[in-house]
């Protein structure tokens, strides 16, 4: 059992609204119907998360791009690494929710 | 647009199943009636991620503790600092799926 | 950092059997396979069998299916190969190595090796 | 199994040499070609995978090619550090087999 307090302006700090690293399931419906498997069968990006000071706030990527990744392709009759590409957040604010 | 291509290897490094950190809302449920509002309304913490090698193996925690944090607590008539406990994994392992 | 380390020597008598161990840290063992390498005194590389600490599969190459058995200890983040009825043709240097993935195999980080001497 | 050959078995080169190592296959491998270094002490690193993706960490002047059965390492610039001894393996099929590996001496 853990004794020590992470204190408040830590916590705080932490869950703030920014890119942070995120898993992310692949979807083999991308990939047609060759594909029989993706290896990894997820990959990490740095996407927005975290909390806003506020509960009318919602936490938004304001700064985006694609990022581009090598991923195996098990197929038939042969398999290869081919290449993804996904969304990663650069930026990121706490904006006021839609209505 | 990103020109560089992330190395497999790279990228499986990265998904593969460990702690990582992990954003958590944080429910008022567990708090009672008193308190209107918690800051801030989510935290971090370690918890297992990512996937395995192998489709029949899943990622699941074998080592896990308890980490106390600060939390602002919004009530009436006085607002304090409290402390809130969450689950963190410290060690993680690919498990075969029950079936 | 990923790690695998393995003892430095082992020293055999003919017809007897040993234990290598290889033990990992810095990364998830079960998220990896375990493979055995063998090079015999200025010789080339030899795939001996891999093994997966997850579930405990293993592959063995046909050539090393009698002699050798893999097995991991999960709790120790450790793989074991255990190598039966040796002779002097199996006095070598055996390596462990990881990898992800059963397809590519390309394995990224190797253990030291293990130099096995077998003599009477 | 598939038989992996480094016709090659030792080449001697200069210091700012560009040295290239041949790796042939007993059949189409589809670039599931991987090579290694060993060092004179025995430490083994991965350099290249699928032919020609660097693995981190290591520099730059390595490179791979090739298609098929016919794989190629390339260091452009040779530097005393690159002494050692380098394999290929192919990694198509099981089991995974090495080439006889190429010494790397200099001149």
């Known amino acids: 059992h853990q004794k020590k307090v992470v204190p408040w302006i830590d916590v705080y700090a932490r869950a703030t609204c920014q890119p942070r690293e995120v898993v992310v399931p692949l979807s083999m419906e991308l990939m047609g119907n060759v594909v029989k498997q993706l290896v990894p069968s997820c990959v990490t990006v740095q996407r927005c998360g975290g909390c806003c000071p506020d509960d009318g706030l919602e936490c938004v990527p304001t700064g985006q791009h694609q990022v581009r990744m090598q991923i195996l392709m098990i197929q038939y009759p042969s398999s290869q690494l081919g290449e993804m590409s996904l969304e990663e957040h650069s930026q990121c604010e706490c904006r006021p929710k839609k209505k | 647009h990103q020109k560089k291509v992330v190395p497999w290897i790279d990228v499986y490094a990265r998904a593969t199943c460990q702690p990582r950190e992990v954003v958590v809302p944080l429910s008022m449920e567990l708090m009672g009636n008193v308190v209107k509002q918690l800051v801030p309304s989510c935290v971090t913490v370690q918890r297992c991620g990512g996937c395995c090698p192998d489709d029949g193996l899943e990622c699941v925690p074998t080592g896990q503790h308890q980490v106390r944090m600060q939390i602002l607590m919004i009530q009436y008539p006085s607002s304090q600092l409290g402390e809130m406990s969450l689950e963190e994994h410290s060690q993680c392992e690919c498990r075969p799926k029950k079936k | 950092q990923v790690q695998l380390q393995q003892p430095g020597t082992e020293l055999v008598k003919p017809g007897a059997s040993v234990k290598l161990s290889c033990k990992a840290s810095?990364?998830?063992?079960?998220?990896?396979?375990i493979h055995w390498v063998k090079q015999r005194p200025g010789q080339g590389l030899e795939w001996i069998g891999h093994?997966?600490?997850?579930?405990?599969?293993?592959n063995y190459n046909e050539k090393f299916k009698r002699m050798a058995t893999l097995t991991v200890d999960k709790s120790s983040s450790t793989a074991y190969m255990q190598l039966s009825s040796l002779t002097s043709e199996d006095s070598a240097v055996y390596y462990c190595?990881?990898?992800?993935?059963?397809?590519?195999?390309?394995?990224?980080?190797w253990g030291q090796g293990t130099s096995v001497t077998v003599s009477s | 199994e598939i038989q992996m050959t480094q016709t090659t078995s030792s080449l001697s080169a200069s210091l700012g040499d560009r040295v290239t190592i041949s790796c042939r296959a007993s059949?189409?491998?589809?670039?599931?070609l991987n090579w290694y270094q060993q060092k004179p002490d025995g430490t083994v690193k991965l350099l290249i995978y699928?032919?020609?993706t660097l693995h981190s960490g290591v520099p730059s002047r390595f490179s791979g090619s090739g298609s098929g059965t016919d794989y190629s390492l390339t260091i452009s610039n040779l530097e005393q550090e690159d002494i050692a001894t380098y394999f290929c393996?192919?990694?198509?099929?099981?089991?995974?087999?090495f080439g006889g590996g190429t010494k790397l001496e200099i001149k």
């Open positions: 190595a990881r990898s992800y993935s059963n397809y590519v195999r390309a394995m990224d980080y």
């Open positions: 810095g990364y998830t063992f079960t998220g990896f396979w």
């Open positions: 093994i997966n600490p997850g579930n405990g599969g293993t």
């Open positions: 059949q189409d491998i589809s670039n599931f």
């Open positions: 699928y032919t020609s």
């Open positions: 393996q192919q990694g198509k099929t099981l089991p995974p087999t």
